[in-house]
Interface confidence: low
């Protein structure tokens, strides 16, 4: 129902803590360069104003939309043009254009230093002194680096962070308690970020229909006993929630997500037998748990998919009468039978089915034409299955670091024009698919691998959009979201690329590399590997391995030397010469 004051309504629904957290996330995602203190001041002002409206909904400005209220706050920030350049032009517009303008200026790759975790003792001290401020800093730092992070989920990760600190700061050895736990949260949060960015891309580029199709497939896999009407209702609600979050309407998004969780828990009987454990949890944990809930057991007596979608005399009639409903039913029926497929694959199959009906229903004898459509799915299914097998075999053979290097070589050959830091980031993320997915049971590998790769490649596309340099990448990124991964997989060495000149300084290293954490060392070595491939795109795997082994040996020797600087300055040039010879 319509509320006199939107801000009062949301404050009442969400409660002060979540309200403040979400406003902080919203401001941090819009204005990514502002300090925590600047944002915290704005948040307090907005919260105080919300409380005024709760006390009296008729008070001045309480009837204004959230976009108007938040936008006015952002536009009142001093030195907006100096700090944000043309984003300040958004403030000359009226709502809803002003909010759209803010959204367009969100930066997926802001030039902010990496979020460094303080020492355990320091962390625990500031956490104990002021837990609220500490968590505020966490929300601010994550949100500004990830401007599309799913806001209610970020509140959940902040809660996890809080619980870990509460537990570990009471331990004698704080460091060994905190490090693995916080690393786990960080890894999960980063995956959550790329997944949500993919959803927002789907919404932005292809609209609500595309996202709803994704939701129907995903929900049908998870809840195979729910009927089509139930799945459609859940997909519609989930689409609304995601549209709101992607659109910066974080208070509405969190509120509607809580409503959806409530609905699911009240209707477990018609949705799934696996929800009870989630439903027993408090709000943030409940919603998170529901989003990751295990698949319900598939009904035993499902008839063959062919009955309604190939062999029914009325296929074309049913399709013509209500295309979206008929295709939605197909996607639902196919997905509930295939929890072992990725959502991307299921959407490709639905697209193939749609194209087949479009062609065949116009022919003289449609059944003869579409009669083999299910058999024509076979190559579409085999392709990702082979991808999973090949890559998991390689991962098992090489381990994560070696697997990342193999992917780095492959992708540098596909798109050598892309900047080395982007290629290294992409390869490291793509390489993590091995650890994340290849260790899972056979029937869970494909959905894990392909849907994760699709999300990572979406980030590659977003970064490339900013500065397009590779025709290969542009081609794969301009197509539909579900075709991206197969497109990237099919790319081969870019024959149009003119190899980079060999620059000795690119391969010159200093003793400071020895004190770097292992991850940073790996990135340095991977940067060198990408540069080598850019210099020799057709170098064989053996040549590259020889050079990289030599490089690793050089680092090991010099980092163990008594006089490291001398070792690096004398052995370095020899290494460069050997590299050139090995690749000649």
């Amino acid at each position: 129902e319509a509320h006199k004051s939107e801000i009062a309504h949301r404050y009442n629904d969400l409660g002060e803590q979540h309200f403040k957290g979400l406003v902080l996330i919203a401001f941090s995602q819009y204005l990514q360069k502002c300090s925590y203190d600047e944002h915290a001041k704005l948040v307090q002002e907005v919260t105080d104003f919300a409380k005024t409206c709760v006390a009296d909904e008729s008070a001045a400005n309480c009837d204004k939309s959230l976009h108007t209220l938040f936008g006015d706050k952002l536009c009142a920030i001093p030195n907006l043009r100096e700090n944000y350049g043309e984003l300040a032009d958004c403030c000359t517009k009226q709502e809803p254009e002003r909010n759209e303008c803010f959204l367009q200026h969100k930066d997926d790759n802001p030039s902010l230093p990496p979020f460094e975790r303080p020492e355990a003792e320091a962390m625990c001290t500031s956490f104990k002194e002021n837990p609220t401020t500490f968590m505020g800093h966490y929300l601010h730092e994550v949100a500004r680096r990830h401007p599309y992070f799913y806001a209610p989920e970020l509140l959940y990760y902040a809660e996890q962070y809080n619980e870990i600190l509460t537990q570990c700061c009471a331990e004698a050895d704080k460091e060994s308690c905190l490090t693995p736990k916080l690393d786990g949260v960080k890894e999960k949060a980063l995956v959550s970020s790329v997944r949500q960015r993919m959803k927002c891309s789907s919404m932005q580029k292809f609209g609500e229909r595309a996202f709803k199709a994704w939701a129907v497939a995903r929900l049908s896999q998870t809840f195979p006993n729910a009927d089509f009407a139930e799945i459609t209702k859940l997909a519609t609600d989930l689409t609304k929630v995601n549209k709101e979050c992607c659109h910066g309407d974080l208070l509405e998004c969190a509120d509607d997500r809580a409503e959806l969780a409530k609905y699911m828990c009240e209707n477990q009987a018609t949705i799934s037998s696996k929800l009870q454990t989630c439903c027993d949890k408090p709000l943030l944990k409940k919603a998170h748990c529901l989003s990751e809930v295990e698949h319900d057991t598939m009904p035993a007596d499902l008839p063959a998919i062919a009955a309604d979608f190939v062999e029914d005399q009325e296929v074309c009639k049913n399709y013509a009468e209500a295309k979206d409903v008929f295709l939605g039913t197909f996607l639902y029926e196919y997905s509930r039978r295939h929890p072992d497929y990725s959502v991307s694959l299921l959407l490709r199959l639905a697209k193939k089915y749609e194209a087949t009906l479009e062609k065949c229903c116009a022919e003289a004898n449609p059944p003869a034409c579409y009669g083999t459509v299910l058999a024509e799915f076979q190559p579409l299914v085999e392709e990702p299955k082979n991808l999973v097998k090949t890559n998991c075999d390689l991962y098992e053979k090489l381990g994560e670091y070696g697997f990342q290097n193999a992917i780095l070589v492959r992708y540098t050959q596909k798109a050598p024009q892309v900047s080395t830091p982007t290629l290294v980031e992409a390869a490291r993320n793509l390489g993590r698919v091995g650890t994340k997915c290849c260790t899972l049971p056979e029937d869970q590998r494909l959905p894990c691998v392909e849907d994760y790769l699709s999300a990572i490649l979406n980030r590659v596309c977003l970064l490339h959009e900013k500065t397009p340099v590779s025709e290969h990448v542009t081609k794969c990124c301009s197509g539909s979201l579900v075709e991206r991964r197969p497109c990237f997989s099919a790319l081969t060495v870019d024959e149009t690329y003119v190899p980079k000149e060999f620059k000795a300084e690119t391969f010159t290293f200093h003793s400071d590399i020895c004190t770097l954490p292992e991850k940073e060392k790996q990135i340095k070595k991977q940067t060198a590997l990408a540069e080598l491939v850019k210099h020799k795109p057709k170098a064989t795997a053996e040549q590259l391995k020889t050079v990289m082994d030599d490089f690793a040996q050089f680092l090991d020797t010099c980092c163990k030397a008594a006089d490291k600087d001398t070792c690096f300055s004398t052995e370095g040039p020899n290494l460069v010469t050997r590299c050139k010879d090995a690749l000649a």
């Epitope: 008839p303 063959a304 062919a306 009955a307 062999e311 003289a364 004898n365 059944p367 003869a368 083999t372």
Partner: antibody, heavy 119, light 110 residues
Framework: EVQLLESGGGLVQPGGSLRLSCAVS????????INWVRQAPGKCLEWIGI?????TTFYATWAKGRFTISRDSTTVYLQMNSLRAEDTAVYYC???????????????WGQGTLVTVSS | DIVMTQSPSSVSASVGDRVTITCQSS???????LSWYQQKPGKAPKLLIY???KLTSGVPSRFKGSGSGTDFTLTISSLQPEDFATYYC???????????FGCGTKVEIK
């Protein structure tokens, strides 16, 4: 183990009727298409018709009107009316390869039942 | 009318020989809807090849199907004792009601 087993064949007079049965075990009939095919002694194979998983039936042009295919939960039937001498043949039921509802790909066959039409 | 012509009607060959059987269809089959079957006396036919060239699971690789449109071939690269049988082609058309088989090629021992 999946099996198709025909029965109901025998000697019938011209103009008479006969109902053949194909008992299917090991698979759910609501998931598969089943065909009837016949072979006159020393002659070609001849496709008679098909019943799809959905229950929809199709017939060879020459078989329309005289032959009817139906099924219940475990058996597919071929009802033959106005039989002639040239209908003498071994009658087989056969399953269509899943996913190829309209193609002549029959991967499982029964052992056949002989029908003789003679006075 | 649909006509499916198989040739030769019989062929005598020895173990190890290469045997080629052809199947001509008028009109063209629909979307490569062509199959090959093997039948031994007193037995039901057995599906060897579908979609003109795809081998059914468990069928030895010495059997090879090729062709498209109106002209199709079944080749047995090196005849084995168990291959002596009658071979039929089957075609599917734009109407399912036109499904037709060839009249067979008998492969006999020389």
């Amino acid at each position: 183990e999946v099996q198709l087993l025909e029965s109901g064949g025998g000697l019938v007079q011209p103009g008479g009727s006969l109902r053949l049965s194909c008992a299917v075990s090991g698979i759910d009939l609501s998931n598969y298409a089943i065909n009837w095919v016949r072979q006159a002694p020393g002659k070609c194979l001849e496709w008679i018709g098909i019943i799809w998983a959905s229950g929809t039936t199709f017939y060879a042009t020459w078989a329309k009107g005289r032959f009817t295919i139906s099924r219940d939960s475990t058996t597919v039937y071929l009802q033959m009316n106005s039989l002639r001498a040239e209908d003498t043949a071994v009658y087989y039921c056969a399953r269509t390869v899943p996913g190829y509802s309209t193609a002549p790909y029959f991967d499982l066959w029964g052992q056949g039942t002989l029908v003789t039409v003679s006075s | 009318d649909i006509v499916m012509t198989q040739s030769p009607s019989s062929v005598s060959a020895s173990v190890g020989d290469r045997v080629t059987i052809t199947c001509q269809s008028s009109p063209s089959v629909w979307s490569n809807f062509l199959s090959w079957y093997q039948q031994k006396p007193g037995k039901a036919p057995k599906l060897l090849i579908y979609e003109a060239s795809k081998l059914t699971s468990g069928v030895p690789s010495r059997f090879k199907g090729s062709g498209s449109g109106t002209d199709f071939t079944l080749t047995i690269s090196s005849l084995q004792p168990e291959d002596f049988a009658t071979y039929y082609c089957g075609g599917g058309y734009s109407s399912i009601s036109d499904t037709t088989f060839g009249c067979g090629t008998k492969v006999e021992i020389k």
